[in-house]
């Protein structure tokens, strides 16, 4: 896939941007007590494009992607209270917890660096 | 597809653009004199946001990811001449025409109607 | 001169997927200039055009068919190809490969015709 | 339902002439060229003219194509029995639901 577009000659003023916000997760399992946790959302205006096509095609098709996804991301376990399970008293889930965020190819499988 | 966003509570100055940009596009085929004709293309910012998965899955994966493409296209004929081919000497190409833009789904086939 | 010759199944299932193949002779599909169709008539009725392809595998489809339909091309064995998925019984008709000149409006050769039909 | 309109029936003597219409819109004969196709009984279809008024070889001079606005006109002089066929005609639509469309036919029956 070609390098993510931050700047366009034809819009000198703008800028592509993707934040990794802070936000308050809940992570919650059935019949489990739902945890609150700190953790972070991709959320942003990458660029894209799309270029008249032609049949038959001269070239490749010039359309581009580009999407805010996780560029890093870790999983970490989160322990939930079972309190109505006896025989599962506790539950383990995995959690991603997104380190940054960049505009990447829409097509591109963000980097859960796991699943 | 959820329906394109085109503003975010969290980022209130913010807004999605998608616009079709006047080109000149030159069209071409091997052997053939190329043309230049008008034509658009889009190009902008949609908004696109990922918020942190977990294993197993709670809910749907909040994914949403808008891409500018063309939102209405015709396809014309251009026909080209091709001095040097006497069985073939002339060679019709058809051209998608952009109308206008839109932000759109990533996932979703772009509207070029027939390719 | 140029012939096409259509083969495949005569009969095919509700839902399944028809599989025509068209065989070109007395000419090259890889010499530029031509557009290779297919195209349809039903029973008693008109001409619906299917779509084109170009040796490089380009394609063009007529946009109300295009969510079933994919043309291809093998230009090792001089052949075009068509799939048509998830056919109902309005999708029996005499099927026609045919060569488009550089002239996108100009079908100059057409195949004899292979009729198939959607039926149970 | 066709997107160009052609007469369903013409007919006439041996020796006399036909004519048959194909209206269309801007976005089809108005701005692209149109072709005539033969189809006798049981048989593929043959272009007969293209471009407009232009005709392959082989094929007689008693076929003759012409264009006007949005509407083109196939002639057919000197009628034979062996002329009793349908006809279609045939161009590019460049609409939104672009694509190569035909008329609905029409049958040339010699009286």
């Known amino acids: 896939a070609p390098p993510p577009i931050n700047k366009l000659a034809l819009f000198p003023d703008k800028s592509a941007w993707c934040e990794a916000k802070n936000i308050t997760q809940i992570v919650g399992h059935s019949g489990c007590e739902a945890k609150s946790i700190q953790n972070r959302a991709c959320l942003g205006q990458c660029f894209s494009y799309s270029v008249p096509n032609t049949f038959p095609q001269s070239t490749e098709s010039l359309v581009h992607c580009d999407s805010c996804m996780p560029a890093q991301s870790m999983w970490e376990i989160v322990t939930l209270e079972c309190p109505g399970h006896e025989e599962v008293p506790r539950v383990d889930k995995l959690v991603e917890k997104i380190v940054h965020c960049s505009c990447q190819a829409c097509g591109k499988e963000p980097s859960h660096e796991g699943l | 597809a959820p329906p394109p966003i085109n503003k975010l509570a969290l980022f209130p100055d913010k807004s999605a653009w998608c616009e079709a940009k006047n080109i000149t596009q030159i069209v071409g085929h091997s052997g053939c004199e190329a043309k230049s004709i008008q034509n658009r293309a889009c190009l902008g910012q949609c908004f696109s946001y990922s918020v942190p998965n977990t294993f197993p899955q709670s809910t749907e994966s909040l994914v949403h990811c808008d891409s500018c493409m063309p939102a209405q296209s015709m396809w014309e004929i251009v026909t080209l001449e091709c001095p040097g081919h006497e069985e073939v000497p002339r060679v019709d190409k058809l051209v998608e025409k952009i109308v206008h833009c839109s932000c759109q789904a990533c996932g979703k086939e772009p509207s070029h109607e027939g390719l | 001169e140029v012939q096409l010759l259509e083969s495949g199944p005569g009969l095919v299932k509700p839902s399944q997927t028809l599989s025509l193949t068209c065989t070109v002779s007395?000419?090259?599909?890889?010499?530029?200039?031509?557009?290779w169709s297919w195209i349809r008539q039903h029973p008693g009725k008109g001409l619906e055009w299917i779509g084109y392809?170009?040796?490089?595998?380009?394609?063009y489809y007529n946009p109300s068919l295009k969510s079933r339909v994919t043309i291809s091309v093998d230009t090792s064995k001089n052949q075009f190809s068509l799939k048509l998925s998830s056919v109902t019984a309005a999708d029996t008709a005499v099927y026609y490969c045919?060569?488009?000149?550089?002239?996108?409006?100009?079908?100059?050769?057409w195949g004899q015709g292979t009729l198939v039909t959607v039926s149970s | 339902q066709s997107v160009l309109t052609q007469p369903p029936s013409v007919s006439a003597a041996p020796g006399q002439k036909v004519t048959i219409s194909c209206s269309g819109s801007?976005?089809?004969?108005?701005?692209?060229?149109v072709s005539w196709y033969q189809q006798l009984p049981g048989t593929a279809p043959k272009l007969l003219t293209y471009?407009?008024?232009k005709r392959p070889s082989g094929i007689p001079d008693r076929f003759s194509g012409s264009k006007s606005g949005t509407s083109a006109t196939l002639g057919i002089t000197g009628l034979q029995t062996g002329d009793e066929a349908d006809y279609y005609c045939?161009?590019?639509?460049?609409?939104?639901?672009?694509?190569?469309?035909f008329g609905g036919g029409t049958k040339v029956t010699v009286l």
């Open positions: 045919a060569r488009t000149n550089s002239r996108i409006t100009m079908i100059a050769d």
């Open positions: 007395g000419g090259s599909i890889s010499s530029g200039g031509y557009y």
């Open positions: 392809i170009y040796y490089s595998g380009s394609t």
């Open positions: 801007s976005s089809n004969i108005g701005n692209n060229y």
């Open positions: 471009d407009n008024n």
């Open positions: 045939g161009t590019w639509d460049s609409s939104l639901s672009a694509g190569h469309v």
